[in-house]
């Protein structure tokens, strides 16, 4: 058993049929010594008396808010949550496996630049009685500070018969060094509580591996005289790290016909312009990637040819 | 060429070679679906690699003030990785294919380190890996980790030379 926060405790249980459970001793936070009784949740049934209460925690029915009273007055509360371990593996019932980029990916994170700011998100089908708390650091043995905000519900989607809820959180490394080569990964820890079930999820990454620039901005076409060719130009996204002579991007320019089956013409360039042939009803798209490190490409920025 | 005394390197040549190094480092080990091996026992060989850290003057401001600190750091790293790529981690079994990009990568690391430090000039070369022989069973994992680490190192070096070529070239 360990304390998650004031008056909230997590009981770690090996979860299998007829498991013996964990013996837990609760102590009433009071100077009083006698006349103390204990109840669980809203029930008025007295579970025991005295300053301490010993219980055997085996299942969710044994978890909940234990309250000690004296003469009708509440003295203190202890909320017990359960953390299940099945076959040596902690349960992951609350969050959905996003399976990208690999199985057992519950948290996904992205950064738009090297400033030390990043966003993580996760999915669940649970809509009520759900709380999250997020902590992060750079490295684990001698952790350096990363500050995370509160997790918020960022999207709701319908997937078949189910509703899916996306939560996200923004974090910022306290003393980020954008130009340095990271040697210690960022660690992100999410505590999830659904009713009386506790679970924790972690992710470990370097900012360089989760970089995904915003799409190029101000995508423009300039027809070239007496030619089917056009000059496409664009700019670095505002959110990208500066100076651009140091934090450089490379670009992919694609000409795509109306039909998905049509052959795509692609050009790769380090410049912020390119000359391509504009086919009727086609569109021109440009995306960006870090020039020197193969992290994710941005989403496409597109304009129609006409 | 970067002379320890402080004259400028051939920024444009260094930029071209460092960008080639980035390409080679990724073709030698493309990132296959984030094969995440950080949790798999960190061997000394990959713990001891020199990193370009915050105080090494490799940021745009530091380069403007005095690029020598940064160039020396990059030089040390190039020598370190060049030695690693020549060690039995890469020359032993399981054999690399004769046309593996690791050979070109190895040669380019040497080429860039020589551009930074012509013969006859000597920066003290810290952190030469003292490598005890590796076992074949360790090598695939070690290669993976070294190449991943090298990708990060050469990315920073390439940014330095690109910025230098754009803003510090005479």
């Amino acid at each position: 058993i360990w304390e998650l926060k004031k008056d909230v405790y997590v009981v770690e249980l090996d979860w299998y049929p007829d498991a013996p459970g964990e013996m837990v001793v609760l102590t009433c936070d009071t100077p009083e010594e006698d006349g103390i009784t204990w109840t669980l949740d809203q029930s008025s049934e007295v579970l025991g008396s005295g300053k301490t209460l010993t219980i055997q925690v085996k299942e969710f029915g044994d978890a909940g808010q234990y309250t000690c009273h004296k003469g009708g007055e509440v003295l203190s509360h202890s909320l017990l949550l359960l953390h299940k371990k099945e076959d040596g593996i902690w349960s992951t019932d609350i969050l959905k496996d996003q399976k990208e980029p690999k199985n057992k990916t519950f948290l996904r994170c992205e950064a738009k630049n090297y400033s030390g700011r990043f966003t993580c998100w996760w999915l669940t089908t649970i809509s009520t009685d759900l709380t999250f708390s997020v902590k992060s650091s750079r490295g684990s043995s001698d952790p350096q500070g990363v500050t995370c905000g509160a997790a918020t519900l960022s999207a709701e989607r319908v997937r078949g018969d189910n509703k899916e809820y996306e939560y996200s959180v923004e974090c910022q490394e306290d003393s980020a060094c954008p130009a340095a080569e990271e040697s210690l990964p960022i660690e992100v820890m999410v505590d999830a509580v659904h009713k009386l079930k506790y679970e924790n999820y972690t992710s470990s990454f370097f900012i360089r591996d989760i970089i995904k620039p915003d799409p190029p901005k101000n995508l423009q076409l300039k027809p070239l005289k007496n030619s089917r060719q056009v000059e496409v130009s664009w700019e670095y996204p505002d959110t990208w790290s500066t100076p651009h002579s140091y934090f450089s991007l490379t670009f992919c320019v694609q000409v795509q016909g109306k039909s998905k089956r049509e052959k795509k013409d692609r050009v790769f360039t380090d410049k912020t312009s390119a000359t391509v042939i504009c086919r009727k009803n086609a569109s021109i798209s440009v995306r960006a990637q870090d020039r020197y490190y193969s992290s994710s490409w941005s989403e496409w920025a597109s304009v129609p040819c006409s | 060429r970067a002379v320890p005394g402080g004259s400028s390197p051939a920024w444009t040549q260094c930029q071209q070679l460092s960008q080639k190094l980035c390409t080679l480092a990724w073709s030698a080990h493309p990132l296959v679906g984030h094969m995440d091996l950080r949790e798999e026992g960190d061997e000394e060989t990959t713990n001891d690699v020199p990193h370009i850290q915050c105080g090494d003057g490799c940021d745009p401001q530091g380069l403007r003030d005095n690029s020598q600190f940064c160039l020396q750091r990059i030089h040390q790293g190039l020598i370190f990785y060049e030695k690693l790529l020549g060690s039995d981690i890469f020359t032993g079994e399981p054999s690399l294919l004769p046309d593996s990009p690791v050979g070109q990568l190895h040669a380019s690391l040497l080429g860039l380190s020589q551009l930074l430090q012509p013969e006859g000039h000597h920066w003290e070369t810290q952190q030469i890996p003292s490598l005890s022989p590796s076992q074949p069973w360790q090598r695939l994992l070690l290669r993976f980790k070294i190449l991943r680490s090298l990708q990060a190192f050469v990315a920073v070096a390439a940014r330095v030379f690109a910025h230098g070529a754009a803003t510090l070239s005479p």
């Epitope: - | 020549g86 039995d88 054999s95 004769p98 076992q135």
Partner: antibody, heavy 115, light 107 residues
Framework: EVQLQQSGPELVKPGASVKMSCKAS????????MHWVKQKPGQGLDWIGY????????NYNEKFKGKATLTSDKSSSTAYMELSSLTSEDSAVYYC????????WGQGTTLTVSS | DIQMTQSPASLSASVGETVTITCRAS??????LTWYQQKQGKSPQLLVY???TLADGVPSRFSGSGSGTQFSLKINSLQPEDFGSYYC?????????FGSGTKLEIK
């Protein structure tokens, strides 16, 4: 075509030393380690050790430490093995071979130790 | 150290027959195993590496299998040139050791 050309047969007296060579061609000599293997007449194969010609790093079978010394010369793409304090037990064919999974072997050097 | 136990020590077979040679490692060597053929007075020739990958130029009647501690080399439809000695060898860790060999003779 990859070739490992070993030096010719040796007849030496007990207590003496001998140095045999293995010249590599057809590949970049410093790209692969070079192993040495001993085979006594009518018997099996015994690994002696390897040298990495790139940095002259060596790895010996405990059994052959103090007996065999491996060296190499990058300029001539040649690996060497010196055997010291020879006895009749050292009479054997000695092979050099590049990485096991590449399958390149020298033709062998026959060493006879006899008074 | 990992020991390689090879069997049988010798084997007589006729042209056209199929034979199997086995090799057992004293520890898990995954697939870090090679098979060699050696003719009298000649250098060993690589047949199979990584337990089951046929070396260049090796006829498809040869096949390697196994992983972990149990391995085998199978020769289908024996040809006259297949007679000689066969060795397995691990390259999982030093010291690299060879099996004691299997002498394949014509019946």
């Amino acid at each position: 075509e990859v070739q490992l050309q070993q030096s010719g047969p040796e007849l030496v007296k007990p207590g003496a030393s001998v140095k045999m060579s293995c010249k590599a061609s057809g590949y970049t000599f410093t790209s692969y380690v070079m192993h040495w293997v001993k085979q006594k007449p009518g018997q099996g194969l015994d690994w002696i050790g390897y040298i990495n010609p790139y940095n002259d790093g060596t790895n010996y079978n405990e059994k052959f430490k103090g007996k065999a010394t491996l060296t190499s010369d990058k300029s001539s793409s040649t690996a060497y093995m010196e055997l010291s304090s020879l006895t009749s037990e050292d009479s054997a064919v000695y092979y050099c071979t590049s990485n096991w999974d590449r399958g390149y072997w020298g033709q062998g050097t026959t060493l006879t130790v006899s008074s | 150290d990992i020991q390689m136990t090879q069997s049988p020590a010798s084997l007589s077979a006729s042209v056209g027959e199929t034979v199997t040679i086995t090799c057992r490692a004293s520890g898990n060597i995954h697939n870090y195993l090679t098979w060699y053929q050696q003719k009298q007075g000649k250098s060993p020739q690589l047949l199979v590496y990584n337990a089951k990958t046929l070396a260049d130029g090796v006829p498809s009647r040869f096949s390697g299998s196994g992983s972990g501690t149990q391995f085998s080399l199978k020769i289908n439809s024996l040809q006259p040139e297949d007679f000689g000695s066969y060795y397995c060898q691990h390259f999982w860790s030093t010291p690299f050791t060879f099996g004691s060999g299997t002498k394949l003779e014509i019946k």
